[in-house]
């Protein structure tokens, strides 16, 4: 029959500066039942405020809605752990929205392949941003990231699109069954969880080129140019 | 009220087993536990472990690991201390004590075993 | 372990007296720190618990107070029924652990 452990709050994640939950993990178990609460204030401000809600974040978690969030200010908040033997307190975090963003997957990839009749194949895929982020506003920069690799493949091939939401790639193995997938990450903040993968059946009939690929680039405003495997790696992330 | 009633004094041999039970009333016993602390004849309180009636948790001391049990029964409410290879040197008071609202707020009467060949 | 060292082992006093008992850990114990009484053939009582709040029915003449380490227990005005061993006891970590107890005599 112990107090509780130190928890210790350890994860804040905002989807779209508008709303944001905080997460915690409970210190050693005391062997009896433990209750938790969260309180905050506004750096700055001395009033301390409990968590506005439990239960939307799941279980250790305090959510934060719309009318709970300020932008430009940092949050002070710990959590209290107390069975009848005593409290815990978690040490104090500091959380300011901006730089804990990380938006929903982005949403829609498709994913095709064409095959113009004067130049290579190759797969384009396009994607649209998570709804929950307004881009119109200026607020957020989104950068993005795809990765494939063919079915039965370990190793997962990744290439970096800057603010795009298209992309095109040269280069993959004919006959083969790809998926593909990408993530988004605010200028400042996490990247998201990748999409749902969506597969590609290559055309056994696709064109092989090692030495070229050819992709989008962003300053090209989605025209396309042949690049090499060298300057290739300056896109490239594995 | 809360009350914590542990059973008659008990006479053993060296090597036998004991087995001293703690029987709880006046609360919700499956959201504590049981924890027994012995006291030596002119000595102070020694705290032996305890049996979590919430969860079955057990946190012993180390120098009874070996052989003692503890446990909780919460159909009976009724805390168990089972101490087997006894030596002269667990001829003790034993009590019970237990969380109702605050640390260690109700014990038992007390249990003297007393061994002896 | 974490150590508990009371001090006096056994003090005197009048009725009326005010008398402090302390008790030092040999680490910090986050203020988990009980006391007891108790008197010749009979359980300990709780008196204080997290170093300085008292358990329901006991009187105000006691007081608990300290932190991290250092501890003491304060009787404002001794009563004969207050000739008895205290103990301290810390429960921040497993085993738990008693100090060796302060016996108040009456002078």
């Known amino acids: 029959q112990l107090p509780p452990g130190k928890p210790e709050i350890f994860k804040c994640r905002s989807p779209n500066k508008e709303t944001f939950t905080c997460w915690w993990r409970p210190g050693t178990d005391g062997g009896l039942p433990t209750n938790y609460s969260l309180t905050y204030h506004r750096e700055g401000e001395t009033l301390m405020h409990e968590c506005p809600d439990y239960i939307t974040g799941g279980p250790n978690s305090c959510h934060f809605g719309k009318q709970y969030t300020s932008m430009w200010r940092t949050y002070v908040m710990m959590v209290n752990a107390t069975n009848q033997m005593g409290s815990s307190f978690s040490d104090e975090l500091y959380v300011d929205v901006t730089y804990i963003v990380q938006p929903d997957p982005p949403l829609e990839l498709t994913v095709e392949v064409k095959q113009p009749e004067d130049r290579k194949p190759y797969l384009w895929m396009k994607w649209s941003p998570p709804t929950l982020i307004d881009l119109k506003t200026g607020w957020f920069t989104l950068l993005y990231e795809i990765r494939l690799k063919p079915e039965k493949a370990a190793e997962w091939e990744t290439h970096f699109a800057g603010q795009q939401t298209e992309f095109k790639i040269l280069s993959l193995h004919p006959g083969q069954k790809y998926l593909v997938q990408v993530r988004c990450k605010p200028d400042h903040g996490y990247w998201s969880a990748w999409s749902p993968a969506t597969f590609i059946q290559i055309p056994s009939d696709f064109i092989m080129n090692d030495e070229q690929k050819l992709i989008s680039e962003e300053d090209l405003g989605g025209e396309q140019k042949l690049i090499s495997e060298e300057d290739l790696h300056h896109h490239h992330h594995h | 009220q809360v009350q914590l009633v542990q059973s008659g004094a008990e006479v053993k041999k060296p090597g036998a087993s004991v087995k001293v039970s703690c029987k709880a009333s006046?609360?919700?016993?499956?959201?504590?536990?049981i924890t027994w602390v012995r006291q030596a004849p002119g000595q102070g309180l020694e705290w032996m472990g305890w049996?979590?009636?919430?969860?079955?948790?057990?946190d012993y001391a180390q120098k009874f690991q070996d052989r003692v049990t503890m446990t909780t029964d919460t159909s009976t409410t009724t805390g168990y201390m089972e101490m087997r290879s006894l030596t002269s040197d667990d001829t003790a008071v034993y009590y019970c004590t237990t969380v109702v609202r605050r640390p260690f707020d109700f014990w038992g009467q007390g249990t003297l075993v007393t061994v002896s060949s | 372990d974490i150590q508990m060292t009371q001090s006096p082992s056994s003090l005197s006093a009048s009725v009326g007296d005010r008398v402090t008992i302390t008790c030092r850990a040999s680490?910090?114990?986050?203020?988990?720190l009980a006391w007891f009484q108790q008197k010749p053939g009979k359980a300990p009582k709780s008196l204080i618990y997290?170093?300085?709040s008292l358990q329901s029915g006991v009187p105000s003449k006691f007081s608990g107070g300290g932190s991290g380490t250092d501890f003491a227990l304060t009787i404002s005005s001794l009563q004969p029924e207050d000739f008895a061993t205290y103990y301290c006891?810390?429960?921040?970590?497993?085993?738990?652990?008693f100090g060796q107890g302060t016996r108040l005599e009456i002078k």
């Open positions: 006891q810390q429960y921040s970590s497993y085993p738990i652990t």
């Open positions: 680490q910090d114990i986050n203020n988990f």
């Open positions: 997290a170093a300085s």
């Open positions: 006046g609360y919700t016993f499956g959201t504590s536990g």
């Open positions: 049996s979590s009636a919430y969860n079955g948790k057990t």
